[in-house]
């Protein structure tokens, strides 16, 4: 159950401009590297549905109300996308700077039996989350400009992320 | 100690439903673990079949099983199933039970840490 | 799905050589790889995780390399009880939806 799920855009505008990439800084040891940084004159898609926010080659859904972190994920994969993958620091930027005051889960898990932080597609993180000694399994990003470990019970408001059509 | 072993396997004739079993000891499936089977057909390579998220039983198939395979788990007895039906030949080969760490929700899995030795399915009338 | 590529199928090594196997996925798998030694008749072994992680217990004559697409195992020093097949596996999954691992066709390593 959803209540009140709405985009963070405004006018729900749909770019229709097809973008270059701009290469982005090697820093595959935190945050392995990503699609964005690998083909410098690719085009990408750049549609968006309704109310997501267009960046790169991505589509964003920045909720309004708030779930747990499974909900989040299953919303998420209602849309035909997944929580987002904050894999570079640009991006990083660009969703802390939309997030402002607000924590968004993102799709960062805490694998217990190796004591690693994983993303949802497996690859590794090796930078750094706050509160790990909380023993949390979930990662937000927002407030703290920070990955910030969190309760994957407690509900916070979530960005899911899909390639732009 | 942890372990995996595998049950059930034997000769099938073609059509045939088989039901493996993986008995998992020295860890408990209500922790986060994405339990597998993988298969071997004699003198070839490895070849993953389906997976299972031991706490809630999210699970996983390869493409090709179309659906003639189900993977279950049971969390009071610490078991994995995997019940084969519509067997043919080319379902000859070894079965491995195998497990990988995995992060909350059954997402942030990773490599096959432990393997159980594997029991053998020979399909042929 | 991600496909992968391992190559050679079958390498010969003198005692105290060095083996190089490589794994060429399909597309960026983000250091998502495991490298497994597999002795004839046993279950597999974890080797190497997360592309260049050697597991515990493992020697450290076994080195994993790459990212991207293109990733390589290398045994130095080869003893005659690395004699096995040796395969790699993806589990980099794109989706976020379930394993869509991957093995390469392996590698026999045959110790002179």
């Known amino acids: 159950y959803f209540p009140q799920v709405f985009g963070k855009s405004n006018d729900g505008f749909v770019p229709t401009e097809s973008y270059g990439t701009t290469s982005v800084q090697n820093v595959s040891q935190i945050f392995g590297r990503n699609d964005e940084s690998t083909m410098p004159t690719r085009s990408y898609g750049t549609v968006c549905p309704r109310n997501w926010d267009f960046h790169q080659g991505k589509c964003f859904f920045f909720s309004f109300s708030e779930s747990p972190w499974k909900d989040s994920m299953d919303y998420c994969a209602t849309q035909g996308s997944t929580l987002a993958i904050v894999n570079t620091p640009e991006k990083l930027k660009y969703l802390q700077d939309i997030a402002g005051i607000e924590n968004y889960f993102i799709g960062l898990v805490r694998q217990p039996g190796e004591k690693k932080w994983r993303w949802i597609n497996n690859s590794v993180f090796n930078g750094n989350v706050t509160n790990q000694d909380q023993n949390f399994d979930c990662v937000t990003i927002g407030l703290t400009k920070t990955y910030d470990a969190a309760s994957c019970e407690v509900s916070y408001r979530w960005i899911c992320e899909m390639n732009a059509k | 100690q942890q372990q995996l072993e595998e049950s059930g396997g034997g000769l099938v004739k073609p059509g045939g439903t088989l039901t493996l079993t993986c008995t998992a000891s020295g860890f408990s499936f209500s922790s986060s673990y994405y339990m597998c089977w993988v298969r071997q057909a004699p003198g070839k390579g490895l070849e993953l079949i389906a997976c299972?998220?031991?706490?809630?039983?999210?699970?996983w198939y390869a493409t090709w099983v179309n659906g003639r395979f189900t993977i279950s788990r049971s969390t009071s007895l610490n078991t994995v199933d995997l019940k084969m039906t519509s067997l043919t030949a080319a379902d000859t080969a070894t079965y491995f039970c195998?497990?990988?760490?995995?992060?909350?929700?059954?997402?942030?899995?990773?490599?096959?840490?432990?393997w159980g030795p594997g029991t053998l399915v020979t399909v042929s009338s | 799905d991600i496909v992968m590529t391992q190559t050679p199928a079958s390498v010969e090594a003198g005692v105290g050589g060095t083996v190089t196997i490589k794994c060429q996925a399909s597309e960026d798998i983000y250091s998502s790889l495991a490298w497994y030694q597999q002795k004839a008749g046993q279950r597999p072994k974890l080797l190497i995780y997360?592309?260049?992680t050697l597991a515990s217990g493992v020697p450290s004559r076994f080195k994993g390399s790459g990212s991207g697409t293109e990733y390589t195992l290398t045994i130095s020093g080869v003893q005659p009880d690395d004699a096995a097949t040796y395969y790699c596996?993806?589990?980099?999954?794109?989706?976020?939806?379930?394993?869509?691992?991957?093995f390469g066709g392996g590698t026999e390593v045959v110790v002179k």
């Open positions: 299972i998220y031991s706490s809630s039983g999210r699970t």
């Open positions: 997360d592309a260049s």
């Open positions: 596996q993806n589990y980099y999954d794109s989706t976020g939806s379930g394993y869509g691992a991957a």
């Open positions: 195998a497990r990988s760490y995995a992060g909350y929700g059954g997402y942030g899995y990773a490599y096959f840490n432990l």
